[in-house]
Interface confidence: low
């Protein structure tokens, strides 16, 4: 008789692929345009990244540092009317895509919570969410939340509100901060709270101290869904050395949990690589017109148009991985575990029940190495294969689909490499 | 294979409520994000879509007959059901109910035979 | 919520091609890939041709096909055959997250 089938686990929308956070419509569109009309025109965009959900704004009225003149429930003109933004939402439900909308107060100030007021403006929010839940958005975002004076008890309120509209909205909280007990702290009070941190970036970006950062995240939150970034806002590039951008994709998507990205993330947008860029928003490169003021200064490997155009590009790198991500149960919900192997190396496996396995063998390392995978370390249900197929590597150079033999791997400096290898009873 | 079937009165008097179910085999009306609609036809003319309610149990309703139109869902039965309050001559018509969806998937795939109402004292 | 607009009738010769339009507005056929066609022979339910403007379910002849311009989708069949006499109804998904179906179209096959 065969194995009786694992039940699946409860999932719930944003634990089937990524968030993709734009934080500025303006930058996010380009040059002379920068509204939720413009925006709707993006969405096939979005859609051919697979992503689950886009965190947007903040959208509503702001004068920096004026609680007066800040409205939560009122969207700045500048981005566009209720209509535009209604319009987006029904948009985005056509093509499968949630909408989380940022509701940090005082984005366009300095203390995003206006630290002097932070109970009428705690209870702004409160009210601000069971207007745009009515509204038809998908959860919410507050940043910044160690500035909010007794952080775990408001985002324990405004959870129940959200939860109580209904299970299916998410609630996102972002922190500066990449202390682990702090984060448990916020965590331990929310049950279904994302947060997203600095954690993963307070990295020497080797092998064996990221697989530390990783086990010890997941072993201090226990069986709750993580969320894996590098920041609550930033861009990779603002984080990451060049060489290393191709292996953390390949690490967020594959880590369990949901992999939160930043606009311009999958084309390796960088921060104010542009002269007069502001370093929080630069201007998403579309094509090579995206920047008119200096001719010249964008070429066509850096937009997406040209790296649409090319299979060996981190966009189409992104792509492929999103999509591995979103249909794999392995990828989805499955077990996680790490192993022994070379000096530099993160190597783990992602299994379920009887589904398709992943092998994902990270060298962080600047010099070639041999994988020396050692499988003593995996419980019996996990065991390693002697060949594994390739899904993709990280660089180019190597076949698609081609079986590998474990115990022969070789990995190129800061490769990394996403097997697949079946159940075997 | 989905199946739809329409039950309730082939007659109702004016001023009445009418009530019809639409049980659903082949499938659970809850599993899936699908859109459990009505639509109708009065004699002799076109398609009219009435409502619908979303597995979610969110509705919408066609705004000419808003005010009158209540559907909800048995989940328990795999049913769902259309009252239609303060029947007039003008809603005699064959009911139709039908499934749209899941999700973004945004076309009537499966409909019921559909079953006669006449409103008439 | 105002219905689609259909031509009331349409008619061709057997092997011949026919074109049916359907006309909405900004809210509905214009705003949304969602215009679906639907055939019904006298009393039946209605069968679904054609979804997402072009895409044909499986099943359905390949005579059968569907376009969109603007505010103004169409239905093509080709090859027109006796059996493809009945009345064919256009519908779109609205912003409003409702549905609205065009009045009909009766296809005489002469």
């Known amino acids: 008789r065969a194995p009786r089938c694992r039940e699946l686990p409860a999932q719930k929308w944003w634990h089937t692929g990524a968030l993709y956070r734009i934080g500025d419509l303006q930058a996010f569109q380009g040059h002379g345009s920068g509204n939720l009309a413009g925006l709707k025109g993006r969405l096939d965009y979005l859609s051919s990244l697979k992503v689950k959900g886009l965190v947007l704004g903040p959208l509503h009225k702001n004068q920096k540092d004026d609680v007066a003149q800040t409205d939560l429930l009122q969207i700045d003109p500048n981005f566009g009317s209720k209509e535009d933004f209604d319009n987006l939402l029904q948009s985005a439900k056509k093509k499968s895509i949630r909408v989380i909308l940022d509701l940090t107060p005082n984005y366009r100030g300095e203390n995003l919570w206006f630290s002097t007021q932070v109970d009428s403006v705690a209870t702004k929010v409160k009210d601000a969410l069971e207007f745009w839940l009515q509204a038809g958005v998908d959860g919410f975002q507050v940043r910044d939340i160690e500035n909010l004076k007794d952080a775990s008890s408001f985002l324990a309120e405004w959870e129940n509100i959200t939860k109580g509209f209904s299970e299916d909205r998410l609630l996102i909280a972002g922190t500066n901060s990449s202390d682990l007990q702090q984060i448990v702290s916020l965590l331990e009070s929310n049950k279904d709270l994302l947060l997203t941190s600095s954690y993963l970036s307070d990295s020497s970006f080797t092998g064996e101290h990221t697989k530390s950062l990783v086990t010890q995240y997941l072993n201090a939150t226990g069986n709750r869904w993580c969320s894996w970034s590098l920041s609550q806002a930033g861009l990779l590039t603002s984080f990451l050395p060049a060489q290393l951008l191709r292996l953390y994709q390949l690490m967020l998507f594959t880590l369990p949990g949901t992999p939160v990205f930043s606009y311009g993330d999958e084309i390796g947008l960088k921060a104010a690589a542009l002269p007069g860029q502001p370093v929080e928003a630069p201007v998403m490169l579309w094509d090579e017109s995206s920047f008119p003021d200096i001719p010249g200064a964008v070429s066509a490997n850096m937009t997406v148009k040209g790296q649409s155009e090319d299979p060996g590009s981190l966009l189409s790198l992104f792509r492929q991985l999103s999509d591995q991500r979103s249909k794999e149960r392995s990828l989805l919900h499955g077990d996680f575990h790490t192993f022994s192997s070379g000096p530099g190396l993160f190597s783990y496996i992602r299994h379920w029940d009887q589904n398709e396995r992943f092998l994902v063998v990270l060298n962080f390392g600047d010099v070639g190495l041999s994988a020396g995978l050692q499988a003593s370390d995996l419980p019996a249900s996990a065991s390693l294969p002697t060949k594994a197929d390739l899904v993709l590597s990280t660089q180019p150079g190597r076949e698609e689909g081609s079986p590998l033999e474990l115990e022969r791997l070789k990995l190129e400096p800061h490769e990394g490499l996403l097997l697949r290898f079946p159940y075997v009873a | 294979q989905v199946q739809l079937q329409e039950s309730g009165p082939g007659l109702v008097k004016p001023s009445q409520t009418l009530s019809l179910t639409c049980t659903v085999s082949g499938g659970s009306i809850s599993s899936g994000a699908y859109y459990w609609s009505w639509i109708r036809q009065h004699p002799g003319k076109g398609l009219e879509w009435i409502g619908y309610?979303?597995?979610?149990?969110?509705?919408y309703y066609n705004p000419s007959l808003k005010s009158r139109v209540t559907i909800s869902l048995d989940t328990s039965k795999n049913q769902f059901s259309l009252k239609l309050s303060s029947v007039t001559a003008a809603d005699t018509a064959v009911y139709y109910c039908?499934?749209?969806?899941?999700?973004?998937?945004?076309?009537?795939?499966?409909w019921g035979q559909g079953t006669l109402v006449t409103v008439s004292s | 919520q105002s219905a689609l607009t259909q031509p009331a009738s349409v008619s061709g010769s057997p092997g011949q091609s026919i074109t049916i339009s359907c006309t909405g507005t900004?809210?509905?056929?214009?705003?949304?890939?969602?215009v679906s066609w639907y055939l019904q022979h006298p009393g039946k339910a209605p069968k679904l041709m054609i979804y997402d403007v072009s895409n044909r379910p499986s099943g359905i002849s390949t005579r059968f096909s569907g376009s969109k311009s603007g505010n103004t989708a169409s239905l093509t069949i080709s090859g027109l055959q006796a059996e493809d006499e009945a009345d064919y109804y256009c519908s779109s998904f609205t912003s409003s997250s409702t549905w609205v179906f065009g009045g009909g179209t009766k296809l005489t096959v002469l």
């Open positions: 309610i979303y597995y979610s149990g969110s509705t």
């Open positions: 039908a499934r749209a969806g899941p999700k973004w998937e945004l076309w009537f795939d499966y």
């Open positions: 900004s809210s509905d056929v214009d705003n949304y890939n969602y």
